[in-house]
Each structure stands twice: as C-alpha cells, then as structure tokens.
Interface confidence: low
C-alpha cells in the first residue's frame, strides 16, 4: 500500500478548501451557470446578464404591456394577453409588470375555454323554455321545458317560465287554456253563467214570494189562539261584488279576436328581448 | 364540419345591383360574426363589413358605407351581401368568411362578379 | 384606418430555405395580428393568429412573432406545396385592414 506524506495530504486539504467543488445544486431563488450560482431576476424584470465571479445578475424591468410573474432568467418578457373586443373580450383586469391581463366576455357571451382566449354568444331558450340558470362568463345558459301551469311566449336568455295567469283571483273566467307557450286567456263572466244564475234568482225569489203568500193566507184564518204579530217581508240585501261589478283595482280590456281580454293587472305584455351582440 | 357555401357566379351591367349569398352549416349562424372580403383580379384582399346574425347588427367599410348592405337570414342560416352602383372596378371575388374563436378562420369558396358593360 | 405594409412584395427561394415576410402596422396593434396563405384560385387560409398562434392543423413550419407595430412571419423550411401569396391582417381595430401580400416562387 502507497503511503502519502503527511504533508501532500495537508497540502490537498488546503487545495479542496480554496477552491470548492463546482455545486450541483443552487439555493431557492438562485440558478446554476458556468459552475456558478447566480441570483434570478424578481417577478416583473428580465435577465440582462449572467453574473460572474466579480458581478451580480443584472436585471432590466419589463416595459410597458409586459410581465413576468416569476422569479426567472427570461431574456424576453411576455406580452400582456390582448383582450379581442371583436371576439367578445374586454378587460377585467388590467396587466402589470407581475401579471398578465385578464380577459373576459362582453355582457350576453361567455369564455369558450378556461384561459378565455374568445367568447360566444349566450345561448337563448326558445318559446316554451325558460331559463333555469343564467350564463356566466364561462358557462352557457341552462334551458328548462316550462312545466304545466307555467309558459315562455319569448326567446330569451334571461327569462324564468311564468306562471299562469290566475283568472279566478280576478273574477274572470279561462276563456282559453294556456300551454307552454301561452298564457291562459281570461275573460269576464260569460253569458251561459248568467243564464243559469238568473233563472236561479228568480226561483228563489219565486219560492219565497210563495211562501210569503201561504203565510199570509194561515195567518187570515180565525184561531183561537192569539193572533201572530203581522210578519213583515224581510229585506233581502244582493251583494254588490257580483261577477261583473267588481269593484275591485280596474282592469284593463283588450279584444282578443271578439272577445274582451284583460291584461292581468302589474303584468306586462312581454315581447322578445333582443339578444345584445 | 363548418362549411359556407356562396352562390354562382355572375355578370352584371354598371350601375346595377348584385346580391350575394353564402349558406353556413355545420355551426350555430347565430353565434358568430359573418363578414364579406373581395379581391379584385390580381390584388389583395379587402374588407367589407360584417354583420352579427343573432341581431342583424351590421358594420361597414367607410369606403363601401353607402353602397353595401348586409343582412342574415337566421331561418335559413344565409348571409347576403347587396352592393349596388356597380361599377367596372368592383370586379372581383366576394368571399363570406366566419370570424370567432379565430379571425377569419373559415371561409366561402368565393363568387366572382364581373361588371361589364 | 389602420395600413399594414407588407414586404417584400415577392420572393424567390429554393426547398428548404428558411423564409421571413415581414409586415409593419401604421400604429400599435398589439399583437393582433393574423396570416393567411392564398393559392390561385382558392380562398385563404388561417395559419397565425394572434401574432404567434399557429391554427389547428397548420404544420410547425409555420410560425409568427411580433408585437406593437412590427411582425414576422417565417416558413422554416420551404416545402413545394407552400407556393402561394401570404397576407397579413391586423384583427386590432375595425376597419380590418390586410398587407399587399407576398408571393413566394421556388427557384
């Protein structure tokens, strides 16, 4: 076995300590080059130069309408994202020398993808569907069927199904059944109601004038007991909230065809929205 | 797949009126703008104007403003382009082109329009 | 309205040159511009978008850079089937305005 001198192996000690082994490896925020660890340039600057065993690294800050938003050695910023307004972009938030531009779509579209690079429009729902969630900036409307008892007459990306309108609440009667499309058609009272009703009227009245009259005649009879007190007719009191005197808010007539319409109170005629672009 | 298909050719006197129309399919019509570009026999291209169907909302090249009229039919996802007082100059190829998620990313196979007298 | 200058207005190049049209919008366009590749008697076709967004199904040969006012486009490797004219456009501002085209010839 080869001995060393005492000396050579302190002599190579000395040597290891003045001149390191190159790293492997640079500290968090640092980078290897030529054996050396240089510092990298912060968020919002670019690499000018490496450094050297005499110079730090030299950074340059981004110009306007770019960034970097990491620690880095990007010789080149990026360039802010251009929000298209012809592909329905606008800005939502501006860029900075640290972060980019963030695009989103113009009211009435929304992002095709995640990164919002364009936009499409909002889909509408067609008569007989009602919107059931409202579009956002990255998702589409969401139609529903409007169930029985509810219509859509529009095409619309805002609107709900609507209820149908509730006649008797305003002492109308259905003239004309609604669907999904169509609300209910209300009217007033119809002739037939009032033929029925009327003969009915004057039944009763009828019934008791006879009863009236028979009581009359008993009471003419001589009996040994004490006369009854003369009864007089009773006064019969006819409400005045009939169908067809109602007294209550007015309503507003329309002719559907020949006959009369009301256009239920606080609401109102709706007609298509039109879609902004 | 997306396709736009123009009407035929045709030959026209100055003075008069041509109406050109290009049928997309394979797309939502309604959900993206449609514009008109020509090129006329060895130049470039040009812009027109465009027209969003969903609205018939509609925007011109100042430079044919009173001349071109776009419109869009949603019923049968057709576009039309009318220019009128023609002139021997406005020879060209009409192309309809769809612009979207990228500009100008499909277009029409072209009708060319020959004015003469 | 917005001028895009294309040039040169043709050029000559042998298979597999390296090819760059240049085009020079009058004010900042950002990075919106597009090229299109047009051949005799067809209409265009999109192959940059955004400046430097290659679309789909164009091959990596194709490339665009730029941003403000001055643009690149390169063709890395001239192949015989991209004879054609190639215009660029800004998609910035309407009116959209197109360059005069390039027409690039095999030698």
């Known amino acids: 076995m080869v001995r060393l001198p005492l000396q050579c192996v302190l002599w190579g000690c000395l040597l290891t300590a003045v001149h390191p082994e190159p790293p492997t490896a640079c500290r968090e925020k640092q980078y290897l080059i030529n054996s050396q660890c240089c510092s990298l340039c912060q968020p919002g600057q670019k690499l000018v130069s490496d450094c050297t065993e005499f110079t730090e690294t030299e950074c340059l800050p981004c110009g306007e309408s770019e960034f970097l938003d990491t620690w880095n050695r990007e010789t080149h910023c990026h360039q802010h994202k251009y929000c298209d307004p012809n592909l329905g972009l606008r800005v939502q938030q501006k860029g900075t020398s640290e972060t980019d531009t963030i695009c989103t779509c113009e009211e009435g579209w929304h992002c095709t993808s995640e990164a919002c690079e364009s936009c499409v429009l909002h889909r509408s729902c067609s008569p007989g569907f009602g919107v059931k969630q409202i579009a956002t900036g990255v998702s589409d409307t969401i139609c529903e069927p409007c169930p029985v008892g509810f219509f859509s007459n529009v095409s619309s990306a805002f609107e709900k199904c609507h209820p149908w309108t509730s006649c008797e609440t305003k002492d109308l009667v259905v003239q004309q059944a609604g669907t999904n499309k169509t609300d209910v058609v209300c009217g007033p009272q119809d002739r037939l109601r009032a033929l029925v009703v009327i003969p009915i009227i004057f039944g009763i009245l009828f019934a008791i004038l006879l009863v009236l009259v028979f009581i009359k005649k008993v009471a003419k009879k001589p009996t040994n007991k004490a006369p009854h007190p003369k009864q007089e007719p009773q006064e019969i009191n006819f409400p005045d909230d009939l169908p067809g005197s109602n007294t209550a808010a007015p309503v507003q007539e329309t002719l559907h065809g020949c006959q009369p319409v009301t256009q239920e109170d606080g609401k109102e005629s709706r007609i298509s929205v039109q879609e902004r672009q | 797949q997306v396709q736009l298909v123009q009407s035929g050719a045709e030959v026209k006197k100055p003075g008069s009126s041509v109406k050109v129309s290009c049928k997309a399919s394979g797309y939502a019509f309604t959900s993206y703008w449609m514009h008109w570009v020509r090129q006329a026999p060895g130049q470039g291209l040009e812009w027109m104007g465009q027209?969003?169907?969903?609205?018939?909302?509609?925007q011109y090249n100042e430079k044919f403003k009173t001349r071109v009229t776009i419109t869009a039919d949603k019923s049968t996802s057709t576009a039309y382009m009318e220019l009128s007082s023609l002139r021997s100059e406005d020879t060209a190829v009409y192309y309809c082109?769809?612009?979207?998620?990228?500009?100008?990313?499909?277009w029409g196979q072209g009708t060319l329009v020959t004015v003469s007298s | 309205d917005i001028q895009m200058t294309q040039s040169p207005s043709s050029l000559s190049a042998s298979v597999g040159d390296r090819v760059t049209i240049t085009c020079k919008a009058s004010q900042d366009v950002s990075t919106a511009v597009a090229w299109y590749q047009q051949k005799p008697g067809k209409a265009p076709k999109l192959l940059i978008y955004?400046?430097?967004y290659r679309y789909t199904g164009v091959p990596s040969r194709f490339s665009g850079s730029g941003s403000g006012t001055d643009f690149t486009f390169t063709i890395s490797s001239l192949q015989p089937e991209d004879i054609a004219t190639y215009y660029c456009?800004?998609?910035?501002?309407?009116?959209?305005?197109f360059g005069g085209g390039t027409k690039v010839e095999i030698k």
């Open positions: 027209i969003n169907p969903s609205n018939a909302r509609s």
């Open positions: 955004s400046a430097s």
């Open positions: 456009q800004q998609h910035y501002s309407t009116p959209w305005t």
């Open positions: 082109a769809r612009w979207g998620l990228q500009p100008f990313a499909y």
